[in-house]
């Protein structure tokens, strides 16, 4: 009889999003009588090993196509065509290859949030930094020097409260101020820098009796 899928319930995952350098296997397990043949298309055209650096592995008994060490040029629609003299069936999978291209740091929206604190209490600010390249993270506070908030070149005066290089792509950082006084009130910054650029977020602490 005509070809049919033997595992249709497992073939509903049409999109594969795969980080670059990993291995992908598309499968279209089928049966029929006589045993059907399988062929593969990429973006509607016949797909063969020579079309790809590193080639492909086809296993007709496994109804599979394997691509090792995928790269961005492997993105596209992959269609298996299974046919015998009684008919033909096909399934299309979409492959997205995720590149890890560095970007300037991203700070999670809404963090750190402004806070109002009672004199003598403890406060904690929270900043979330995302950066592909190693970021330099700083907690800063705006200060006055000789009664002025900005230097001769117009750059605000700041003091560095904490500074470190993060080893993590996703850094969850906190600034803790204990036993706050009125001097702690004012404008602060969470700043993250990598070799591509800078991201910073200003926030305020108000201290009242």
């Amino acid at each position: 009889g005509a070809p049919y899928w033997t595992r249709p319930e497992r073939m509903d995952k049409k999109l594969l999003a795969v980080p670059a350098a990993n291995t992908v296997r598309f499968r279209c397990p089928a049966a029929g009588n006589p045993t059907p043949s399988i062929s593969w298309l990429k973006n509607g055209r016949e797909f063969r090993g020579e079309h790809r650096i590193g080639g492909i592995k086809l296993a007709h008994q496994q109804w599979s196509l394997v691509m090792e060490s995928v790269v961005p040029s492997d993105r596209g629609n992959y269609t298996c065509v299974v046919e015998n003299k009684f008919g033909s069936i096909r399934q299309t999978y979409t492959l997205d290859v995720l590149e890890r291209s560095p970007h300037r740091p991203i700070l999670q929206a809404g963090l750190p949030a402004n806070q109002t604190a009672v004199l003598g209490s403890d406060v904690e600010f929270h900043c979330k930094v995302y950066s592909d390249a190693q970021p330099h993270i700083q907690w800063l506070k705006h200060v006055e020097v000789n009664g002025s908030k900005v230097g001769p070149d117009g750059t605000p005066y700041v003091t560095v409260l904490k500074s470190w290089i993060s080893e993590s792509v996703e850094a969850d950082v906190r600034l803790r101020l204990a036993n706050v006084s009125e001097r702690d009130g004012g404008e602060y910054l969470c700043r993250a820098t990598n070799f591509i650029g800078v991201a910073e977020k200003a926030f305020w602490l108000s201290v009242h009796g």
């Epitope: 291995t23 499968r27 993590s168």
Partner: antibody, heavy 126, light 109 residues
């Protein structure tokens, strides 16, 4: 050539710590995780934990939780495994291995280890 | 957490077929990788995703995985196949690696 080169043999006293290094070459370090696997004399392979070289995330086998720390230094393409509070049962060969993701349209994703270091012998003896 | 069971030993005459089994509850729903470890050496990946051979691994090796048993088969066994063979799965629930206990292949003669 893709390879992982591990630090040399260590002899430690019970209660001490050991830190084994694993230097990668021949590929982009941050594209693959690193797993650590140990093998006691005459025994099978025992998975200890793994680290994402991309974001530093770690995952440890329950047995080693709290006693092992796996880290990476992307600037030198090196992974480290530190095991603390050593006991005689920790005498083993310790391997690092590159973790590769396999994505299958039917079965989903799976991880395996496609390149292994040569192993580091750690002997714990008083 | 998955538990994988392998027979501890297997003896096969040269030229014959060696069949390694790896038992686990519904292991057929997972993908299995196989490693070969020769004495004094690090393990080597010989099969991934049940049936796929890495480059450099001879066609004499094949794999399958159905129901509660995954299988690695070596046809025309040679003396150089003598080694320990380990199956491995990835437990996606816990993000943990799980190894079988290993099977020691002895090539007779």
């Amino acid at each position: 050539e893709v390879q992982l080169v591990q630090s040399g043999a260590e002899v430690k006293k019970p209660g001490a710590s050991v830190k084994v290094s694993c230097k990668a070459s021949g590929y982009m370090f941050t594209s693959y995780g690193i797993s650590w696997v140990r093998q006691a004399p005459g025994q099978g392979l025992e998975w200890m934990g793994w680290v994402s070289t991309y974001n530093g995330d770690t995952n440890y086998a329950q047995k080693f939780q709290g006693r092992v720390t796996v880290t990476t230094d992307t600037s030198t393409s090196t992974a480290y495994m530190e095991l603390r509070s050593l006991r005689s049962e920790d005498t083993a060969v310790y391997y690092c291995a590159r973790v590769l993701g396999y994505y299958d349209s039917i079965d989903g994703y799976y991880y395996g280890m496609d390149v292994w270091g040569q192993g580091t012998t750690v002997t714990v003896s008083s | 957490q998955s538990v994988l069971t392998q027979p501890p030993s297997l003896s096969v005459a040269p030229g014959k077929t060696a069949t390694f089994t790896c038992g686990g509850n519904n292991i057929g729903d997972k993908s299995v990788h196989w490693y070969r470890q020769k004495p004094g050496q690090a393990p080597v990946l010989v099969m991934y995703l049940d049936t796929e051979r890495p480059s450099g691994i001879p066609e004499r090796m094949s794999g399958s995985n159905f129901g509660n048993t995954a299988t690695l088969t070596i046809t025309r066994v040679e003396a150089e196949d003598e080694a320990d063979y380990y199956c491995q799965v990835w437990d996606s629930g816990s993000d943990h690696v799980v190894f079988g206990g290993g099977t020691k292949l002895t090539v007779l003669g």
